[in-house]
Amino acid sequence: RAPRCRELPAQKWWHTGALYRIGDLQAFQGHGAGNLAGLKGRLDYLSSLKVKGLVLGPIHKNQKDDVAQTDLLQIDPNFGSKEDFDSLLQSAKKKSIRVILDLTPNYRGENSWFSTQVDTVATKVKDALEFWLQAGVDGFQVRDIENLKDASSFLAEWQNITKGFSEDRLLIAGTNSSDLQQILSLLESNKDLLLTSSYLSDSGSTGEHTKSLVTQYLNATGNRWCSWSLSQARLLTSFLPAQLLRLYQLMLFTLPGTPVFSYGDEIGLDAAALPGQPMEAPVMLWDESSFPDIPGAVSANMTVKGQSEDPGSLLSLFRRLSDQRSKERSLLHGDFHAFSAGPGLFSYIRHWDQNERFLVVLNFGDVGLSAGLQASDLPASASLPAKADLLLSTQPGREEGSPLELERLKLEPHEGLLLRFPYAA
């Protein structure tokens, strides 16, 4: 008799794929645009990325460092009107994209949470949560919570409001901290909180260290749902050299949890390559005309248009990974087991019950390596086969779909492999 199927876990929408942050509407849209109406016109692009949620803003009125002139219920007229926002929400819903609103109060000021009047600010946030939930928002983000006194208790209160309205609403908190203990203390009292931090930014881009950071985090957080990013707001290129961007995309999409990206991460947008652009939020490169300041500074392969036409581009990889992440049970909610594969490598298995299983092998080093996969590290429920089919490689030149012998697996420098194999009873 066939074994009984394992009961599926309850899945919220943010469990099913990536979140996409647009902190700066003007930089994202470019060409002097930068409002909610213009963003509505970019929703088809977000759909093509298969992202599940858009983390937007902050877009509320904020007079720098002035509590009285900060209104979390009002949209800054530079970004549009409440009607524009409602229209964006409706269009996003039609395309199955959820909208998460950033309510970090003093985003234009010295301290994101003001240095005084904590209770006044907290009350404003509470009122804003209730107002925007009624307006149809799917969740909220608050950043720089290390600057918020008694953050844990405020987050717990805001979480109660959000969840009280509907279990289908999300609260994201962001911190600049990379310290695991600080992160855990924030998570402790907030069961369903999604926390973005700089935790992985200290990975130093080595396989061993990244493996140890990921496994420590997962062990420490137990069975709670995680999010994966390298910071609460910055681009991946702020932390990674170009040759590791593909590897990290593969990793972020295949770890257990919600991957969170910033606009431009999908094309490797890099502020340092665009002289005169704010490093805080460089202009999104839709095509070569997006950055007219310096003729020739932007080549087609740096842009959305150019990369969309190239199946080997970073953007094409992002789209493929996002698609796999949103439809494969083992990647959606499968178990995770990391195991040894040799120095410089990080490898793990994702598996769920009798569904197709996935093996990820990442070479962080700048030399080619043979993977010595130590299957003995794995539990019986996650054993490795002799061969697995190559679903994709982060480097061009491999024949996809071909079976690879796992004992003879060789990886190019900075190469990541995603392999699939069937469940075997």
Partner: antibody, heavy 119, light 113 residues
Amino acid sequence: EVQLVESGGDLVKPGGSLKLSCTASRFAFSTYDMSWVRQTPEKRLEWVAYISSGGGSTYFPDTVKGRFTISRDNAKNTLYLQMSSLKSEDTAMYYCARQDGHYPWFPYWGQGTLVTVSA
Amino acid sequence: DIVMSQSPSSLAVSVGEKVTMSCKSSQSLLYSGNQKTYLAWYQQKPGQSPKPLIYWASTRESGIPDRFTGSGSGTDFTLTISSVKAEDLAVYYCQQYYSYPPTFGAGTKLELK
């Protein structure tokens, strides 16, 4: 009080190489982005290299790109600047500087180490 | 690259006098997304490394006396010392950190009359 101590400066011939070190103490080195800034004999300040906290991301101005590399050993709390194909215009006092978060402005500087490139 | 121009290149003052020095950038340093101005000021005394005075164009670094004031936004900036003390004699540099590469002005040297 944050402390940054540079070393390795020397007199070197054009075309030569040199490696500078900066030892950091009294702060969580591995969580800060770092830079090297130099000051020419004419007292002009010029940023020459950046490295992110984890060491993954590095930036250089065009004047040194391809000749200088920046690295760090977080276990040893040490920042490095490897300079090769040195030119006379690289003669300067080299400072290691801690950044404010990820913004390249510099609240903390070392005392500097002098590099002289001359035949 | 953003070019930073400082004037005057030197300034002779008497103790107790009010002094202002200027810094101009070749493009705006005001980022519209957060309304912050990405400009810093440093003081450098002979034989010492630069010391931070001001960041975000007008925020004093901790421990800096309130006689030092930074002002301006967009492309025109000013550092004012309300009443110069003998210990303020130094070279003052402005620096933009709006975009890569970060760039410095050539400095204004404050000397005694």
